[in-house]
């Protein structure tokens, strides 16, 4: 004969364990039902009655089968330098990621605590290393024969145009000015074309949000703006 199916609550076999989606209640000394994601244990089980589950209250969640007395509080609303990539629901926490043009300057166990604006390279400097989700732009001076006339977090140094007759020679922050009508572009040394920077908005990581106060302010951490690196601007 097949073994009789036990209904919760039930006493486990000596040395045995409770089944999937059940937990052992120390007080009742019984195997009892866990609550599904989106719910929590409103009343714990006894020897004669199973766990009573209830829906998570507004702005709280449980992601796993559980027997917690209260659901977990969702993180604060995303600050102005972040985008909400996952809403707070009964079954999942809010996820905030840095918006395009920003990167995560201070990460936490999961996700980002503080977003910072990507550095912009000033004229005469180009992007040596593009910004990523978790790292800032690195600027470098434009090598001879190349220039950048923009303040940008994405523009690299570009080669000067080659003139048949030069009206004004180019420098690190200005292209050459020709008198002829058909200039050509040199492939000057150092005119490396970098790939476009990756978006700072994650589509695959699942950080938990940092609680935020007013938009754009950090929570608990007195982190001021870092001094701009050489060739960068604080804009």
């Amino acid at each position: 004969l097949p073994a009789q199916v036990a209904f919760t609550p039930y006493a486990p076999e000596p040395g045995g364990t409770c089944r999937l989606r059940e937990y052992y209640d120390q007080t009742a000394q019984m195997c009892c039902s866990k609550c599904p994601p989106g719910q929590h244990a409103k009343v714990f089980c006894t020897k004669t009655s199973d766990t009573v589950c209830d829906s998570c209250e507004d702005s709280t969640y449980t992601q796993l089968w559980n027997w917690v007395p209260e659901c977990l509080s969702c993180g604060s609303r995303c600050s102005s330098d972040q985008v909400e990539t996952q809403a707070c629901t009964r079954e999942q926490n809010r996820i905030c990621t840095c918006r395009p043009g920003w990167y995560c300057a201070l990460s936490k166990q999961e996700g980002c605590r503080l977003c910072a604006q990507l550095r912009k390279c000033r004229p005469g400097f180009g992007v040596a290393r593009p910004g990523t989700e978790t790292s800032d732009v690195v600027c470098k001076p434009c090598a001879p024969g190349t220039f950048s006339n923009t303040t940008s977090s994405t523009d690299i140094c570009r080669p000067h145009q080659i003139c048949h007759v030069v009206a004004i020679p180019g420098n690190a922050s200005m292209d050459a000015v020709c008198t002829s009508t058909s200039p050509t572009r040199s492939m000057a040394p150092g005119a490396v074309h970098l790939p476009q920077p990756v978006s700072t908005r994650s589509q695959h990581t699942q950080p938990t949000p940092a609680p935020s106060t007013a938009p754009g302010t950090s929570f608990l951490l007195p982190v001021g703006p870092s001094p701009p690196a050489e060739g960068s601007t604080g804009d």
Epitope: S55, D58, S59, S73, C74, S76, R77, A87, C88, T89, R90, R94, P211, T213, A214
Partner: antibody, heavy 120, light 108 residues
């Protein structure tokens, strides 16, 4: 755009009942709560209760537990507040307001209000 | 129940003045669950500040909020004529959710 449109003013006699409706448009009724707040003439705001339209679960201020019945019909995106055993002191403007799940109860859109007058 | 007490109950100030309204809770309220509403005569309330210090889109930056625990503040940095209204704080920390009694702001 998001809109909450309430039914018109009501004049009722003491002891009667009234049912106020609040029709929602411009958003998904899922993952929101619909609250009812009352305001007696010249007085402040008083939270009465709320309903989760997706599940029908309700929560009341105990003061209104036996007075107000909250319901909703998702097929017509409408929430209802029924007040029974009306008394003169129930004369008030009744507002519906929504709060999205996860916004910590911030009521971001309100109906225009329904004036209920109880007089013999 | 958590009682919310606002002060002052009413005030009169001139255009350009800095106005501060305080809201004191009878027990601690998480800052995420404290909101402010503005209500003009004959109109429905409007969400002015959510989660203690955050402004919904369209709310002028002269409005700001701060506080924690039991003491919260709404500030209007430079009062404008259109700010004449009654302001309510609201806690959603513990049911039943409650409002302050309101602060009426008049323009001198």
């Amino acid at each position: 755009q998001v809109q909450l449109v309430q039914s018109g003013s009501e004049l009722k006699k003491p002891g009667a009942s009234v049912k106020v409706s609040c029709k929602a448009s411009g958003f998904n009724n899922k993952d929101i709560y619909m609250h009812w707040v009352r305001q007696a003439p010249g007085q402040g705001l008083e939270w009465m209760g709320r309903i989760d339209p997706a599940t029908g679960n309700t929560k009341h201020d105990p003061k209104f537990q036996d007075k107000a019945v909250l319901s909703s019909d998702t097929s017509v995106s409408t929430a209802y507040l029924q007040i029974s055993s009306l008394k003169a002191e129930d004369t008030a403007v009744y507002y519906c307001a929504r709060s999205p799940y996860g916004d910590f109860g911030a009521m971001d859109y309100w109906g225009q209000g329904t004036l209920v007058t109880v007089s013999s | 129940d958590i009682q919310m007490t606002q002060s002052p109950s009413s005030l009169s100030a001139s255009v350009g003045d800095r106005v501060t309204i305080t809201c004191t809770a009878s027990s601690s309220v998480s800052s995420n669950y404290l909101h402010w509403y503005q209500q003009k005569p004959g109109k429905a309330p409007k969400l002015l500040i959510y989660s203690t210090s955050n402004l919904p889109s369209g709310v002028p930056s002269r409005f700001s909020g701060s506080g924690s625990g039991t003491d919260f503040t709404l500030t209007i940095s430079s009062l404008q004529a259109e700010d004449a209204a009654t302001y309510y704080c609201h806690q959603y920390h513990r049911s039943p959710w409650t409002f302050g009694q309101g602060t009426k702001v008049e323009i001198k």
